[in-house]
Interface confidence: low
């Protein structure tokens, strides 16, 4: 049975040309997790392998960074970026847990990050 | 040009160990993950795990794990899966094959087939 | 671990003919679908990556498709050098599974 949940950072937004921290907790559960994938509408971006380490797709190997955590850090951000992101954690045994994230790139100054929100 | 040589067939004993080795070349050896696959006659392929050559670390499929072990030689860029406790189902053609970022197998070795019978 | 069912185990056609391949995933894959053709004695060979990249030096007639729970295999103009033994793998998470084949014979 399935008992974890995934805290994100939910509703983000940030300044073009800016960086940003995408994140995902997974609680509430004793499962191993195996590997993250991260990924943007069906893109992979970067994989985190418990044993592997970080591996960035090389496409995105110049604006995203490893971290923090099993985090990643999006680079000089353009308004392109704005769209939804996806943490997949692989645990064993339960499964596969996914987390979404909503970015926005804004032009502006008046970026702000939005609150944290649980997916069951 | 990548390249991936394989050892030669080998005949083994129930109960027995078997190493098989994999040399890459036309390529930096530490830049790749390098996988071992397997297949049993006429069946489909399975996973056994990977090795990253760069800092040594390994990720099995867990119903290998305990039976296989899987090391790298950087110096003369071979990597080696060795079974351990093999038993007739094991008997199979075994594949070394490498990975870049995303988890397919873009090259593979000739394979190696491994009997094993008594 | 992720289940792969392929679908047919084997077909028969002839050259000149469109054949599609049917992957189905136990779980959402998104689009983390790999495509590979192993002939008789041969090592696989990668076809397709990402469900419907198609590596490097791999005939325009052969298209993959799909993303989530169902994928194809499509070659839009069988040749003779097409007949072989077709593998579906996720690579999604570890551990990366197989699919059981489909072999494509000569009718």
């Known amino acids: 049975m399935m008992t974890g949940t995934i805290e994100t950072t939910g509703n983000i937004s940030a300044e073009k040309g800016g960086s940003i921290i995408l994140q995902c907790h997974l609680s509430s559960t004793t499962a191993q997790v195996t590997q993250v994938n991260w990924e943007q509408q069906d893109q992979l971006l970067a994989i985190c392998n418990a044993d592997l380490g970080w591996h960035i797709s090389p496409s995105f190997k110049d604006r995203v960074a490893p971290g923090p955590g099993l985090g990643l850090t999006l680079q000089s951000l353009t308004v392109n970026d704005t769209g939804e992101y996806f943490c997949i954690y692989h645990t064993y045994p339960d499964g596969t847990y996914t987390g979404r994230i909503f970015l926005e790139v804004l032009e502006s100054s008046v970026a702000e990050h939005g609150a944290r929100f649980q997916i069951p | 040009q990548l390249q991936l040589v394989q050892s030669g067939a080998e005949v083994k004993k129930p109960g027995a160990s078997v190493k098989v080795s994999c040399k890459a070349s036309?390529?930096?050896?530490?830049?790749?993950?390098m996988n071992w696959v397997r297949q049993a006659p006429g069946q489909s392929l399975e996973w056994i795990g990977v090795i990253n050559p760069n800092h040594g670390t390994i990720s099995y499929n867990q119903k290998f794990k305990g039976r296989v072990t899987m090391t790298r030689d950087q110096s003369t860029s071979t990597a080696y899966m060795e079974l351990n406790s093999l038993r007739s189902e094991d008997t199979a053609v075994y594949y070394c094959?490498?990975?870049?970022?995303?988890?397919?197998?873009?090259?593979w070795g000739q394979g190696t087939l491994v009997t094993v019978s008594s | 671990d992720i289940q792969m069912t392929q679908s047919p185990s084997s077909l028969s056609a002839s050259v000149g003919d469109r054949v599609t391949i049917t992957c189905r995933p136990s779980?959402?894959?998104?689009?983390?679908l790999a495509w590979y053709q192993q002939k008789p004695g041969n090592s696989p060979k990668l076809l397709v990556y990402?469900?419907?990249a198609l590596a490097e030096g791999v005939p325009s007639r052969f298209s993959g498709s799909g993303s989530g729970t169902q994928f194809t295999l499509t070659i839009s103009s069988l040749q003779p050098e097409d007949f072989a033994t077709y593998y579906c793998?996720?690579?999604?998470?570890?551990?990366?599974?197989f699919g059981g084949g489909t072999k494509v014979e000569i009718k």
């Open positions: 779980e959402n894959i998104y689009s983390y």
């Open positions: 036309g390529y930096s050896f530490t830049d790749y993950n």
């Open positions: 793998q996720h690579h999604f998470g570890a551990p990366w599974t």
């Open positions: 990402n469900a419907k």
């Open positions: 094959a490498n990975n870049w970022d995303v988890w397919y197998f873009d090259v």
